[in-house]
């Protein structure tokens, strides 16, 4: 049985084979139940979680991960040497640095021990699921009057990453948008001086080097102008408080990576 | 899944005190702008007060202003609503919403409404 | 403040028809525009948002356009689960405000 399966990492070619024992036809065996789908994310190139829901399986089981990089020199099959953990039982894999090979396509395999035919393969573009760290060190200055600027830091080749910028006043509820290209910087030509302003920068993999479809966090929000008028009903804090979630919250050690986690890591 | 209960609602005599708590789950609550949103009988939506996901800057509409405190708790993801000084106007159905991770942020989910009922 | 005025208030329509209701803000806010629709006794439901942008697992039968003062919701072929009240919100500036609200019911 070969399946297509529609990822939301933009591996739209993916495709998952499914083992399948042969069986009478009045019962199913374990071996016809779909393994989970395994969704894999490379930090900033640093290290990689391969994950999948352990939960979805009828018992707690414990499966194991193998990968290879097709066609390559590196097509040796690879057992899982750090498991990540729910509740005890296996849920995902993280791969150091030196086991990462961006632009080879990435062959992962996912078994079930106890029914070894049971065991489905997915083939991945780790270039299309490159997730970076948040831009680092926003720095604003005055160019002219009404004219701001504002510049950032990535730890990364900066020529990878494309970048969002959001900024907002104080009485504004929605944010406006700019993208930015590989340059980490953006121009506000015209600011208000009686007005407090917000920014924030997010950074993806794309264009360039990838095509990721996940952004990274949020930066620290950066604040710029006055804080306080009498019209002004509302309350500020004077400074950015602490990244509430941390970069290691974002897949650090023996840390499970949800969708959702993946999803809702934003500031508003 | 993002679930939103609210809870603290009852009837109260004019000029007393309430407060309403919004209990969430099934997202990074410490990372969303959260809103109370309010309903009279019969009537249509009317937009109360906010919080940013830190809750370093409060928003409050004109009607409650002076009267009612937003405030949350990041570690036990409650979001709440200090009512003080009453009015028999503010007899409503009290949603919490939450921020949708957009530039616009529209409120992408609510709960189901705790009922303030302000009477002598 | 920026006001919001729904239009109309009322609307009475069959199953099949091609729906309209209309929404006006007092000042110019873009597109800073959603829409929400409300069941009897239901919280209300994100539809539309940046005037124009379905909500995730919203029919396509819904549809929002408009910008600066003007914006319509528009339901293509009014759908029995449809019949329902349908609010505008303003989204570009504190205090947040919603529009009076339409009430969608069965001819």
């Known amino acids: 049985l070969n399946t297509t399966i529609l990822t939301p990492n933009g591996n739209e070619d993916a495709t998952t084979d499914f083992f399948l024992t042969s069986m009478p036809t009045d019962s199913l065996s374990v071996s016809t139940l779909p393994l989970p789908e395994v969704q894999c994310f490379v930090f900033n190139v640093e290290y990689m979680n391969c994950t999948w829901n352990s939960s979805s399986e009828p018992q707690p089981t414990n499966l194991t991960l193998h990968y290879w990089y097709k066609n390559s020199d590196n097509d040796k099959v690879q057992k899982c040497s750090h498991y990540l953990f729910s509740e005890e039982i296996t849920s995902g894999c993280q791969l150091q640095k030196k086991e990462i090979h961006l632009y080879q396509t990435f062959v992962v395999q996912l078994q079930d021990p106890r029914e070894p035919r049971r065991q489905a393969t997915q083939m991945l573009k780790l270039q299309n699921l490159v997730i970076p760290w948040a831009p680092e060190n926003l720095t604003l200055r005055k160019l002219s009057e009404s004219q701001l600027e504002l510049n950032w830091n990535n730890r990364f080749l900066n020529h990878c990453l494309e970048h969002l910028v959001q900024y907002r006043t104080d009485w504004d509820h929605s944010w406006t948008e700019q993208s930015v290209d590989y340059r980490h910087k953006f121009s506000l030509p015209s600011v208000d001086g009686q007005k407090r302003y917000t920014f924030r920068v997010r950074s993806r993999f794309n264009p360039l080097c990838g095509s990721a479809q996940h952004w990274s966090e949020w930066s620290h929000p950066i604040h710029w102008g006055s804080n306080s008028s009498k019209e002004n009903p509302f309350l500020f804090a004077l400074e950015a408080e602490q990244k509430l979630i941390s970069e290691e919250d974002l897949g650090g050690e023996q840390k499970l990576i949800s969708e959702e986690d993946l999803h809702h890591h934003h500031h508003h | 899944q993002v679930q939103l209960v609210e809870s603290g609602g009852g009837v109260v005599q004019p000029g007393r005190s309430l407060r309403l708590s919004c209990a969430a789950s099934?997202?990074?609550?410490?990372?969303?702008?959260m809103h109370w949103v309010r309903q009279a009988p019969g009537k249509g939506l009317e937009w109360v007060a906010g919080?940013?996901?830190?809750?370093?800057?409060?928003y409050y509409a004109d009607s409650v202003k002076d009267r009612f405190t937003i405030s949350r708790d990041n570690s036990k993801n409650t979001l709440f609503l200090q009512m003080n000084s009453l009015r028999a106007e503010d007899t409503a159905m009290y949603y919490c919403?939450?921020?949708?991770?957009?530039?616009?942020?529209?409120?992408?989910?609510w709960g189901p409404g705790t009922l303030v009922t302000v009477s002598s | 403040d920026i006001q919001l005025t729904q239009s109309p208030s009322f609307l009475s329509a069959s199953v099949g028809d091609r729906v309209t209701i209309t929404c006006w803000a007092s000042?110019?806010?873009?597109?800073?525009l959603a829409w929400y629709q409300q069941k009897p006794g239901k919280a209300p439901t994100l539809l539309i948002y940046?005037?124009?942008t379905l909500q995730s697992g919203v029919p396509s039968r819904f549809s929002g356009s408009g910008s600066g003062t003007e914006f319509t919701l528009t339901i293509s072929s009014l759908q029995p689960e449809d019949f329902a009240s349908y609010y505008c919100?303003?989204?570009?500036?504190?205090?947040?405000?919603f529009g009076g609200g339409t009430k969608v019911e069965i001819k």
């Open positions: 919080i940013l996901y830190d809750g370093s800057s409060k």
């Open positions: 099934g997202f990074n609550f410490r990372n969303f702008g």
């Open positions: 919403a939450k921020e949708e991770d957009t530039a616009m942020v529209p409120f992408d989910s």
């Open positions: 919100q303003q989204l570009k500036s504190y205090p947040l405000t």
């Open positions: 000042q110019g806010i873009s597109s800073y």
């Open positions: 940046a005037a124009s």
